[in-house]
Interface confidence: medium
């Protein structure tokens, strides 16, 4: 079975059940339902999943049985629409149930919430978790899938199965360990951080497909796979891109069973053809399915073939450039992108796409000119400033990061971005700026050749978080403009924003700067977030405040927290010293 199966199945649900097996089928249906109905209790979802699974089994036994010929969207949508509290819990989302497929599924997709109003996941004591794990392992793992899926409605479903497998392995190993906490907590921290990163990366893929279309996603995939598999032929890369696009289109569209099945087929194809794809795949291909697919997705770039000829011969000097371009624009541009990307693992994917766009724009203009060759002869010279801009930006920011350290670097970005887009909500500015600041520890340690792909492609993922959160409640035309005009120019667009001179400063509210003794019991990370929230609010009150003024206030604030957390009567200290701090800050900032 290739990814492009064309064989008809009488029953799609039976086909997927047989392909995936009962365990994966149930897990994927649970993920799908939790990603659609994010507020439903766990027990309700489990009940729906069990009903769907029992039905699938009847179809496996007899594909001609009643309703077995219905599409998965019809079956799943009908099941979701049986939820009694749909109107009360989800409001207008209930109107989706009045629609027919495929409109009903589209309607459900549009109501996915990137920032659902759900309580923060609090980690119980290790003994409590281990007891729950031993008492009912299956329910414990289902709960994990449910809680992640409902908070991350675009999480890449087959990859979530991989996370769940690791989650199970962590508990299996550590609940038997002498020091359970020392064994388990670092593993859970790692899974949490990797999970957040995986969710954000997939969210960008879905945004790319949904907001900018298949062509944009395919261009991204050509560039990335050509960097990763520089020895593969163009036709091979095109094949992988076509199949990968199908997989991600399915997952982003809620077709999780098809997506997981096709991802497995793609991994199988890659491993069967690794000789013509990459020399780095051997270890990945020896692993079990979930690990194999994950490993392939993360595999390091293969070595570039020796003695690759100059690109100019085919794409600038050849007399056939306009002819080749006219005959099949996307294939010719795809070849250009492939050839450029396989030679430049040191460039970010978004930079490669900007270069391809520049090349395309030049050919569009020049191939209609009197002397096309004369017109496009210097096209590669136009690439120089496009390459230098991210190089310089990364150099400057890595120097700043090395000078300040992560926390203070995040603060510098908080101030920078609050001044650019002060209308954005404070929690969003804090979350996004903290993540932008993590680029330092993630990428600045790399040698020059790896810095740009690490940094700029990571920034694309983080800025997409800003874009999807802002889309839910748009408050800034500047954010909307940077998010919607061009996927590959989002980062340069935000970088180019200056202080928003039209912003009317926020009214001063002492309550925003009132702190209590509970801050003392917070983790270091949570304490940082409190301080960074205050910093954003300060900038919103006084957007023209200088770095020095803000630094002085933040230093005073840090000293105030430290002092009161050491005091015998903490609450009194926070009340009295807090008033003094607010007064001193107002004076320092001229509020």
């Amino acid at each position: 079975r290739g990814v492009f199966r064309r064989d008809a199945h009488k029953s799609e649900v039976a086909h997927r059940f047989k392909d995936l097996g009962e365990e994966n089928f149930k897990a994927l249906v649970l993920i799908a339902f939790a990603q659609y109905l994010q507020q439903c209790p766990f027990e309700d979802h489990v009940k729906l999943v069990n009903e769907v699974t029992e039905f699938a089994k009847t179809c496996v036994a007899d594909e001609s049985a009643e309703n077995c010929d219905k599409s998965l969207h019809t079956l799943f949508g009908d099941k979701l629409c049986t939820v009694a509290t749909l109107r009360e819990t989800y409001g207008e989302m209930a109107d989706c149930c009045a629609k027919q497929e495929p409109e009903r599924n589209e309607c459900f997709l549009q109501h996915k919430d990137d920032n659902p109003n759900l309580p923060r996941l609090v980690r119980p004591e290790v003994d409590v978790m281990c007891t729950a794990f031993h008492d009912n392992e299956e329910t414990f793992l289902k709960k994990y899938l449910y809680e992640i899926a409902r908070r991350h409605p675009y999480f890449y479903a087959p990859e979530l199965l991989f996370f769940a497998k690791r989650y199970k392995a962590a508990f299996t190993e550590c609940c038997q360990a002498a020091d359970k906490a020392a064994c388990l907590l670092p593993k859970l921290d790692e899974l949490r951080d990797e999970g957040k990163a995986s969710s954000a990366k997939q969210r960008l893929k879905c945004a790319s497909l949904q907001k900018f279309g298949e062509r944009a996603f395919k261009a991204w995939a050509v560039a990335r796979l050509s960097q990763r598999f520089p020895k593969a032929e163009f036709a091979e890369v095109s094949k992988l891109v076509t199949d990968l696009t199908k997989v991600h289109t399915e997952c982003c569209h809620g077709d999780l069973l098809e997506c997981a099945d096709d991802r497995a087929d793609l991994a199988k194809y890659i491993c069967e053809n690794q000789d013509s794809i990459s020399s780095k795949l051997k270890e990945c291909c020896e692993k079990p399915l979930l690990e194999k697919s994950h490993c392939i997705a993360e595999v390091e770039n293969d070595e570039m073939p020796a003695d690759l000829p100059s690109l100019a011969a085919d794409f600038v000097e050849s007399k056939d450039v306009c002819k080749n371009y006219a005959e099949a624009k996307d294939v010719f541009l795809g070849m250009f992108l492939y050839e450029y990307a396989r030679r430049h693992p040191d460039y970010s994917v978004v930079l490669l796409l900007r270069l391809a766009k520049t090349y395309e724009t030049t050919l569009e203009k020049c191939c209609a000119a009197a002397d096309p060759h004369e017109c496009y002869a210097k096209v590669f010279d136009e690439f120089k400033p496009l390459v230098e801009e991210p190089q310089n930006l990364i150099k400057q920011n890595c120097e700043l990061f090395e000078q300040l350290g992560e926390y203070k670097f995040q603060n510098a970005l908080l101030v920078r971005y609050t001044k650019k887009v002060p209308q954005v909500s404070t929690p969003t500015l804090v979350e996004v700026s903290r993540n932008l600041g993590k680029v330092g520890s993630k990428c600045c340690k790399h040698p020059e050749a790896k810095r740009m792909p690490c940094a700029e492609d990571y920034l694309s993922v983080v800025l997409n978080q800003l874009c999807v959160l802002h889309e839910k409640t748009p408050v800034s035309d500047r954010v909307t403009k940077c998010c919607t005009e061009s996927l590959v120019n989002r980062r340069p667009c935000f970088s180019a924003l200056e202080v928003d001179e039209t912003y009317v400063p926020k009214e001063f509210n002492a309550e925003t700067f009132t702190f209590h003794a509970d801050i003392c019991t917070l983790s270091e990370k949570e304490r940082q977030i409190k301080k960074q929230t205050a910093l954003v609010e300060l900038v919103k009150h006084k957007p023209k405040a200088t770095k020095e003024q803000l630094k002085a206030v933040m230093d005073d604030f840090a000293a105030f927290v430290e002092k009161c957390c050491k005091a015998d009567d903490k609450e009194t200290c926070f009340a009295e010293e807090g008033k003094k701090l607010v007064a001193a800050s107002q004076a320092a900032l001229g509020l």
Partner: nanobody, 119 residues
């Protein structure tokens, strides 16, 4: 030694159909992407369609999209081009070729088969 042998060309009226075949030998056909190119009288080479070694994906020049279908049978080492709704401007010698390993160069071609579309 690599050999590509095209057949199926001929004279056909506008709006008519033809099916070209290309028998391949001397290389591992099922690991090679293949394409059809054509050369109209007095004109340069124009590529028509590409097919991946596995049968998908396929690509078509804008001028033939929706009218021509490329396919292959790896068990028979044969490449096909189904041409429908033929037009006068499709008149050309059609060659099958092994797809370029990367650049805009074609590794091997056949001798070609002439397709004439005329009333």
């Amino acid at each position: 030694e690599v050999q590509l042998l095209e057949s199926g060309g001929g004279l056909v009226q506008p709006g008519g159909s033809l099916r070209l075949s290309c028998a391949a030998s001397g290389f591992t056909f099922d690991t090679s992407s293949m394409l059809w190119v054509r050369q109209a009288p007095g004109k340069g080479l124009e590529w028509v369609s590409v097919i991946h070694q596995s049968g998908t994906p396929t690509y078509y020049a804008d001028s033939v999209k929706g009218r021509f279908t490329i396919s292959r049978d790896n068990s028979k080492n044969t490449l096909y081009l189904q041409m429908n709704s033929l037009r006068a401007e499709d008149t050309a010698v059609y060659y099958c070729a092994k797809f370029p390993s990367s650049r805009m160069k074609f590794d091997y071609w056949g001798q070609g088969t002439l397709v004439t579309v005329s009333s």
